[in-house]
Interface confidence: medium
């Protein structure tokens, strides 16, 4: 009969390498009389004879998993006990390997440049996959923008455009490699001026192209304001080449103004716009005798339309910054005050006024205005508004009317040509065309060039003296 | 970039009218004043006259009694009329942006001209 | 009727500097323009104003007023300048335009 025997292990659990989802055995071999009791035991857990993932056979020697899992790796140890003599362990690390796994993947990535991206690519396996980067066809180098982070991402500081392109994260260990698809990073860039519109000093009727040029990822629209408005004039010319969008607005200058250059472009939901302004304006026309002081154009006011000749050229004075807009707030501001004035002088002082203001262009193709005629100006002072005149000359020579903002000129009557001496070198009033004791009512009133016949009208001498300055506002 | 095309018959019989049409493209007639130049072969440059868009002309005294132009804003053209022509009205005819009343004096752009032989 | 005189013909080596002038009793009050002109072509505005320059145009044209006389000039000519120059300006009262009789600018 046998002896009783404590158990010895006579092969003791070695270090089991697996991989996922194959089957991993601890062999346990015992010697021992009577026959020992086997059980096994995972992380100090008890291992159950009735947990599905194991097999336990050879009595309770061999234990086999059946479908390793990577959460299975740990220590498992065997414990053989028969009664004699105390327990015995053996213990062994089950190593679950794994082929490199890419469990986040990298995503198309849209960023703005200067801002930081971060291209996941987190990996599973056993040995830890070792990440690395390729770029379209290369390896990616890191360098103080660009580094590959203990997580397998790759992070990128102060995204510049040469940043874009295909990426694709590669994870290896020894039992293979992993790549991931190949997605895309786009750098947008701000909308940025590269060249701003350039200010001008033009003359009158100049024409000036205002270029504007600016980049960005997506391509900048250019849209131009002028004076807080959209331009209503002017063509525009866009070309676009390697990003970089050229708009020109070519201008017919007539006026000053301040214009702005906007460049746009979208971010997803937001959108960037870089400003760039340049001014135009209207150059002082010099002194010099060959400068006329200003150019005739039709007029397209208001206040004068029913006093003047349909279509009439009338001249504006350049030495105003916007001469059709200035004269017309000046009669404007008269016509206003001409409310006060009496039946019979407020049509001949608007007519007076208009024509003084907007006087018409003698023909020609070098501007230059034709004063009104001494005769028509002396019949509305002596005759039409004799009262109010006089009035006016009372109020310290100023004028009768004030805004404090201009002071309107009425013609000094004794300045004007005569008719008399030629009769094209100045504008009568028809409607004054009349003797004295026929005028009871006023026809429309419009101007036309003189012609020869002379009407009976004020000798060109006053009858009182004409002060030099006056003036109406 | 605005640009003139002047277009109309290159032969004209003697005492017949001349009539050429200039179309601008590239932007519009309105606001500027346009003329007419003409250059006999072999020699200088003569101005016939300008239309303001609003139809207001002014023609060189030499030919005024014979020259008649008009413009069409909605077609964006101007037109030159020279009745009872001579061979001494062959030339090149140009038409051109500018040459009135202190809105750009000068002519810029020009057309490319085009050639009318008075002959019977 | 008012006229610009201007000489038929100037010459001038590559490299050299070009002056053309054109009188007239009313250049004193009137501004001058100047055109250039290559056979078959149509002018092109190279002066404006006496001695304004359009864009565009080479800087080495440019043009000066002195009295009754105006002067194109073009310095270190190039063989591309040979062409016809024309002056044009208006008579004393503004009423219409005048061209010069043209200059034929030949490089030699």
């Known amino acids: 009969e046998k002896l009783p025997k404590a158990p010895v292990i006579t092969t003791p659990l070695e270090t089991v390498d697996a991989l996922v989802e194959e089957v991993a055995t601890f062999m346990c071999a015992v010697e021992s009389y009577p026959q020992p009791e086997i059980s096994w035991t995972r992380n100090k857990i008890l291992i159950k004879l009735f947990d599905t993932r194991y097999s336990i056979r050879e009595n309770g020697q061999l234990l086999t998993i059946l479908s390793v899992e990577d959460s299975d790796d740990g220590i498992y140890c065997c414990i053989a006990n028969n009664g004699v003599g105390g327990a015995v362990e053996s213990c062994g690390a089950l190593q679950v390997k794994m082929k490199p796994k890419i469990t986040r993947p990298p995503i198309n990535v849209k960023i703005i440049e200067g801002l930081k991206a971060v291209l996941p690519c987190t990996t599973m396996g056993n040995p830890k996959p070792s990440v690395s980067w390729i770029k379209g066809d290369n390896a990616l180098r890191e360098n103080s923008r660009i580094a590959v982070l203990e997580s397998g991402s790759l992070r990128i500081h102060n995204v510049q455009k040469e940043d874009a392109g295909q990426y694709r994260c590669v994870a290896k260990n020894s039992l293979g490699t992993a790549y991931s698809k190949l997605v895309k990073l786009e750098v947008e860039v701000f909308a940025r001026i590269l060249r701003a519109p350039e200010s001008h000093n033009v003359t009158f009727g100049s024409f000036v192209t205002l270029r504007c040029t600016a980049i960005g990822i997506p391509v900048p629209t250019i849209s131009w304001i002028e004076n807080g408005n959209a331009v209503s004039s002017g063509s525009i010319q866009e070309s676009v080449k390697d990003r970089v969008i050229d708009s020109r607005l070519q201008l017919f200058i007539t006026k000053p103004g301040l214009y702005t250059c906007i460049a746009t472009n979208k971010h997803g939901e937001k959108f960037s716009t870089a400003k760039a302004a340049a001014t135009v304006s209207i150059a002082e026309w010099s002194k010099s005798q060959k400068d006329s002081q200003g150019y005739c154009a039709q007029y397209r006011g208001e206040v004068c339309d029913a006093v003047l000749a349909k279509d009439a050229l009338v001249f504006f004075n350049t030495s105003y910054r916007d001469p059709e807009d200035a004269q017309e707030l000046l009669i404007h501001t008269a016509w206003n005050e001409l409310k006060a004035v009496s039946p019979l002088c407020r049509p001949a002082a608007e007519a007076l006024l208009c024509n003084h203001l907007f006087q018409e262009c003698s023909p020609g193709v070098v501007p230059t205005p034709m004063p009104i005629c001494r005769e028509y100006c002396l019949a509305v002072k002596e005759l039409f508004c004799a009262k109010e005149w006089q009035a006016m000359e009372g109020k310290a020579h100023r004028g009768l009317y004030r805004s404090g903002m201009h002071l309107l000129p009425v013609p000094e009557c004794s300045k004007l040509p005569s008719m008399h001496r030629d009769p094209t070198a100045c504008t009568r009033l028809p409607y004054l065309d009349y003797k004295k004791e026929n005028i009871t009512t006023f026809p429309s009133i419009t101007s036309s060039r003189p012609s020869a016949d002379i009407p009976n009208l004020p000798a060109s001498t006053s009858s009182f003296a004409v002060s030099p300055a006056y003036s109406m506002t | 970039q605005v640009q003139l095309q002047e277009s109309g018959p290159g032969l004209v019989k003697p005492s017949e009218t001349l009539s050429l049409t200039c179309t601008v493209s590239?932007?519009?007639?309105?606001?500027?004043?346009w003329s007419w130049i003409r250059q006999p072969p072999g020699k200088g440059l003569e101005w016939i006259g300008y239309?303001?868009?609003?139809?207001?002309?002014y023609y060189n005294p030499s030919l005024k009694s014979r020259v008649t132009i008009s413009v069409d804003t909605s077609k964006n053209q101007f037109s030159l009329k020279l009745s009872s022509v001579t061979a001494a009205d062959t030339a090149v005819y140009y038409c051109?942006?500018?040459?009135?009343?202190?809105?750009?004096?000068?002519?810029?752009?020009w057309g490319q001209g085009t050639l009318v032989t008075v002959s019977s | 009727s008012y006229e610009l005189t201007q000489p038929p013909s100037v010459s001038v080596s590559p490299g050299q500097t070009a002056r053309i002038t054109c009188s007239g009793d009313a250049l004193p009050k009137q501004y001058a323009y100047w055109y250039q002109q290559k056979p078959g072509q149509a002018p092109v505005l190279v002066i404006y104003?006496?001695?304004e320059r359009p864009s565009g145009i080479p800087e080495r044209f440019s043009g000066s007023s002195s009295g009754t006389t105006v002067t194109l000039t073009i310095s270190g000519v190039q063989a591309e300048d040979e062409a016809d120059y024309y002056c044009?300006?208006?008579?004393?009262?503004?009423?219409?335009?005048?061209f010069g009789g043209g200059t034929k600018l030949t490089v030699l």
């Open positions: 104003k006496d001695s």
């Open positions: 590239g932007g519009s007639i309105s606001s500027y004043y």
């Open positions: 051109a942006r500018g040459g009135g009343l202190g809105i750009s004096n000068w002519f810029d752009p």
């Open positions: 044009q300006s208006a008579d004393s009262s503004g009423t219409y335009w005048v």
């Open positions: 239309i303001y868009f609003s139809g207001r002309t």
